[in-house]
Interface confidence: low
């Protein structure tokens, strides 16, 4: 499988573009919109019929160092009586994000972009039933 | 920035924090192919809080295509297949990092950008806060 390349050949290179060594790209990690606020409905992770917990993974050689992952609390979904209904399934919803990975090779340091799959939350679904012949 | 434990034998000039600008290999290391979520999972249709997926395309961004979820209903689908308005479908939102071409149109110069995407929907009970 080919690893996807970020550079697009169809872009006309303006004169103002910074010079970049072949096979690499310049990346400014001062984040645009760093201070924007998420306006999610309050504590949906515990109000959901497919509730989830959060855990924080921390890696000093990754930027950003903190990545929050969700895990579904139940296999089934929570019904109106507050009981788990195993005729339904809690399933994770996932989203890809980019991180910058720092690699140490002896005393030299290199940087690599990496796609990370983040579990964002859970949703309640009707199970797929496979009929066995 | 973040602090890195350094190899004690390395010269002191190395910065412990991530520098503001880095040179990065053009190849993205990943184990996940960038798939259309409609093909990778049918949760959007099977969920009790189903959603539609909308294609958001921007050639100045990497990835250039991002799929945005929009809940189909205000309520949730009950066991009879009807919408139950005593429950609410709400979007699950996530901040993700993408690359923004900077300066614009440059093929190999980027800046990290944080964007908010709705990834899917979940069914919740409406909540009540008692205010003192």
């Amino acid at each position: 499988r080919k690893i996807p390349k970020v550079g697009h050949t169809f872009f006309q290179k303006p004169e103002s573009c910074p010079p970049v060594p072949g096979g690499s790209m310049k990346l400014d990690i001062g984040i645009i919109n760093e201070n924007q606020r998420v306006s999610m409905s309050r504590n949906i992770e515990s109000r959901s019929t497919s509730p989830w917990n959060y855990t924080v993974t921390w890696d000093p050689n990754r930027y950003p160092s903190e990545v929050v992952q969700a895990q579904c609390r139940n296999l089934g979904c929570i019904n109106a009586q507050g009981k788990e209904d195993i005729s339904m399934n809690s399933v994770p919803i996932q989203q890809e994000t980019l991180v910058v990975r720092r690699k140490h090779q002896g005393c030299s340091v290199s940087f690599q972009l990496e796609k990370v799959l983040v579990t964002v939350g859970c949703t309640c679904v009707t199970p797929v039933i496979h009929h066995v012949q | 920035g973040i602090t890195i434990p350094r190899n004690p034998g390395c010269p002191n000039s190395e910065d412990k924090n991530f520098p503001r600008t880095v040179m990065v290999n053009l190849n993205i290391h990943n184990r996940n192919t960038n798939t259309n979520p409609k093909r990778s999972s049918d949760y959007y249709n099977r969920s009790t809080s189903p959603w539609n997926l909308h294609r958001n395309e921007d050639p100045e961004r990497y990835p250039s295509v991002i799929w945005e979820a929009k809940c189909r209903h205000l309520g949730c689908i009950n066991a009879d297949g009807n919408v139950d308005y005593h429950m609410n479908s709400v979007p699950i939102q996530q901040e993700i990092l993408v690359l923004r071409r900077e300066p614009p149109h440059c093929p190999n110069s980027f800046r990290l950008e944080k964007i908010l995407v709705s990834v899917g929907c979940t069914c919740v009970t409406p909540i009540v806060h008692h205010v003192a």
Epitope: - | H54, C71, V90, P126
Partner: nanobody
Amino acid sequence: EVQLVESGGGLVQAGGSQRLSCTASGTIVNIHVMGWYRQAPGKQRELVALIFSGGSADYADSVKGRFTISRDNAKNTVYLEMNSLKAEDTAVYYCAAEIGYYSGGTYYSSEAHWGQGTQVTVSS
């Protein structure tokens, strides 16, 4: 409490146009979603169109290209512009909104609210 008041229903000829409006009033803190559902005689209530706080909209396949939803955030009002109306568009149209609001010292962060409905009749 929160109230949704619709206006603009009535009798219209097939192929004609109609504009519905709905205003939310009360101790509203924020409106996440506003939109329209409809219910034809003997049928279930169905989604017509929703508009989200960011401005993006969703439409039922049956009305795409004919109906346009818009929103005036300052007035807490949602509009539904209906063009090329067909007999099958005849229904009671209900305004709906997911709203965060205060009531009796209590803050409800996300609750669905409904208008009383307005009748739209398309005659052929």
